[in-house]
Every structure is written in C-alpha cells, then in structure tokens.
Interface confidence: medium
C-alpha cells in the first residue's frame, strides 16, 4: 500500500527534479534570447546598457569547480526574483514603445514565475532554507523617458539572458555531482 492519504509526498529523485529545473531554465533562456533579439531589431541599442538595480553576475569559469547546490539554487532564486520584479516594472512603466512587446513580456513573466515555483519546490524537497534576499529591495522609479525605458529593457533582457545561461551550465554541472 502507498503512503497514507494526506501524508507529505516522498521526495522524488533530486536528479529528476533538477532535470526539470534545467529544462525550464533552458526554455526560458531560449525565450529571453529571442525577445532580446526582437528588442535589438525594433529598438537598436547604441552601445551597452546597464541598470544599477540589477543583480551582479554570480557565476564564471572560475567558480564552476566550487559550486554547491544550496548556494547555486539560493542565489539563482534571489536573482530571478529580482529579474521578475524588473520585468513586472517594465510592463507597468515601460511606456507606449514597449507595449508592442507586451504579449512577449507577459509570456516571459509567466515562464519566469513558473521557474521560480519550480526552484522553490526543488529547494523544499532538498530541505534547503528559502533564503530572503540579502540586499534591501530598491524601489524602481518610473523611467526618465521613453528612451530610458528602452535602454532599461535592453539591460534587463541582456542581464536575464546572461544569468540564465550560467544557470543552465551550473545546474547541468551540479546534476552530475548529485
């Protein structure tokens, strides 16, 4: 007989859970790359753009050897929560120019929320603490101009793409160490 009704679900294979997190992250990476390319086509960027409120990059070639699952999942979740806030802000405050990308930004937000739920589930299955962000959440004010919102969109999508790219690589590597 199976576990009694109402009992907590027995943790599945963490590798399988990690697999599904990798698939979702890859899928979001592909979406972000596509949307960033659309942005570049519609609103060509003059040089590179950055936003002080975005998280700093957490991984590089040098950190791969010392990656630990708890640290990676916690940091990834915190960073993605920040990007989610930025995407929500972009949809709300982006102005008329960015409204043309509203369906794509909406879909991106939904996928981001789904990935965050999956990471939360994975962390609870692995009994990892659901850490809150270290830094205080900086309120995001309205962009200074329409051009300002376009520059912000370039920075947000570029940063999210980079974060997801490293996340896929890190999660794949950690899966082999489980």
């Amino acid at each position: 007989p199976g576990p009694p009704a109402g009992s907590p679900r027995v943790s599945s294979d963490p590798r399988a859970d990690l697999d599904s997190a990798v698939l979702l992250t890859r899928s979001l990476l592909a979406d972000t790359r596509q949307l960033a390319a659309q942005m570049r086509d519609k609103f060509p960027a003059d040089g590179d753009h950055s936003l002080d409120s975005l998280p700093t990059l957490a991984m590089s070639a040098g950190t791969l050897g010392s990656l630990q699952l708890p640290g990676v999942l916690t940091r990834l979740r915190v960073d993605l929560m920040s990007y989610l806030r930025h995407v929500q802000w972009l949809r709300r405050a982006g102005g008329p120019s960015l409204k043309t990308l509203e369906p794509e930004l909406g879909a991106l937000q939904a996928r981001l929320e789904r990935l965050l739920r999956r990471l939360q589930l994975l962390m609870s299955r692995l009994a990892l603490p659901q850490a809150a962000p270290d830094q205080p959440v900086i309120p995001l004010g309205p962009p200074a101009s329409a051009w300002g919102s376009i520059r912000a969109a370039h920075a947000i999508l570029g940063g999210l793409h980079l974060t997801l790219d490293w996340a896929v690589r890190g999660l794949l590597l950690l899966k082999t160490r489980l």
């Epitope: 890859r26 040089g47 590179d48 990059l57 590089s60 070639a61 040098g62 490293w166 896929v168 794949l172």
Partner: antibody, heavy 117, light 110 residues
Amino acid sequence: QVQLVESGGGVVQPGRSLRLSCAASGFTFSHYDMHWVRQAPGKGLEWVAVISYEGSNKFYADSVKGRFTISRDNSKNTLYLQMNSLRAEDTAVYYCARTPGSHFDYWGQGTLVTVSS
Amino acid sequence: QSVLTQPPSASGTPGQRVTISCSGSSSNIGSNAVNWYQQLPGTAPKLLIYYDDLRPSGVPDRFSGSKSGTSASLAISGLRSEDEADYYCAAWDDSLSGVVFGGGTKLTVL
C-alpha cells in the same frame, strides 16, 4: 552590435614573444568570460585559454601552459594574450571569443601569428 | 588527435538531410553542454547550436542538435549549397578544465 577585433599578429622567430589584443565593443565587456581559440593553417579549432569576467580565474590548454598568459583590462574593454617562448606549432589564426555560459556566441575575425626562422 | 571525435567529411545533395556525429566521454559531453559551430571558407566560426539543441536567433530551423549520453549529433535538413562548410562540435571538459573541440567535419553539397 557586438564586435571583437583582434590585433598584434605577425611573423616572429621561434623562442620570441608576441602580445595579442582583442578590442571589444557593443556589450558590457566586464560581464563576460573571454576565450582565445586558435586554428593552425588547414587544421581544426583548438582552445587556448579562458579568463573569468572579473579577471581572477584563468585556465589554459596543456599545449600553452607556462608559456602563454591571458589577461584583460575591463576599463579598456580589451582582452590580451601574452605569448612567450613561441614555437613553430603555435603558428595559427588566433580568435578571441565571448562566452555567456558554455558556448562562444561571438568571435573576432582572427589575427595570424606565424612562427618561423 | 582531438578529444571529441567527428567524421572528417560528410556530403549530400540539395534538399537532402545529413547528420554529423560527435563522440566524447563522461568528462565532456556526458556532463556538459554540447555546442556546434559552422565555419564557412575563409571566415571566423559562427555559433550554430548551443546547450545541445538550442538555436541562436538567425540560425534557420533546418539545423538541429541532439545529445544522448556521451554522443551528440547535428542534423541539417533541406540541404543548401550555402551549407557547404566545416562543422565543429565542442564542450567543456571537467578533467582538462578547458574547452575541447571535435576535429571538424567538412560538409560538401554535391
């Protein structure tokens, strides 16, 4: 748009040194790990070295370890490859490449290094 | 001798489907993403497939990648004359702490 432009190649005698540069533009250079990859005439691609985005971590192919040094100056958006004790087998086109994770998404046009007496 | 093994050549006629294989080990393909690059004659390599099967924007969907265990493959359907190029697979190798490439496959469109 993203651009990587290598320079510093040329003809050099065995045992001598050469420094290659790669000027980056169109993206936030300090956010990306950077690599050097080379290709000997008529041969395949060979990875040479990687440097992490902030410059503190470096990895090298066994064939160049102890002779080549990868470095970067984020304030100048430039990647370097210092090549010492050059050998004939180092003759190749040297490419710099940007990596957002595991792959090279942008490459320079390459600079030719010829090691010959 | 390359760490990843590819056939040196492949060929097909226009409209055909060709597949290029890439074989490695547990320390590279088995535990890391596989990427594919296309190098047209006289030019720098270009990213074709990343993370095993993802296509960068601008790469036609005629190109697809797949991976199983310690092997990967690149498939090109609806072959065109402009696909004539060298194709390289690559992956990070945990043992070597570096990127390893296949020897390259020269694709000829007959």
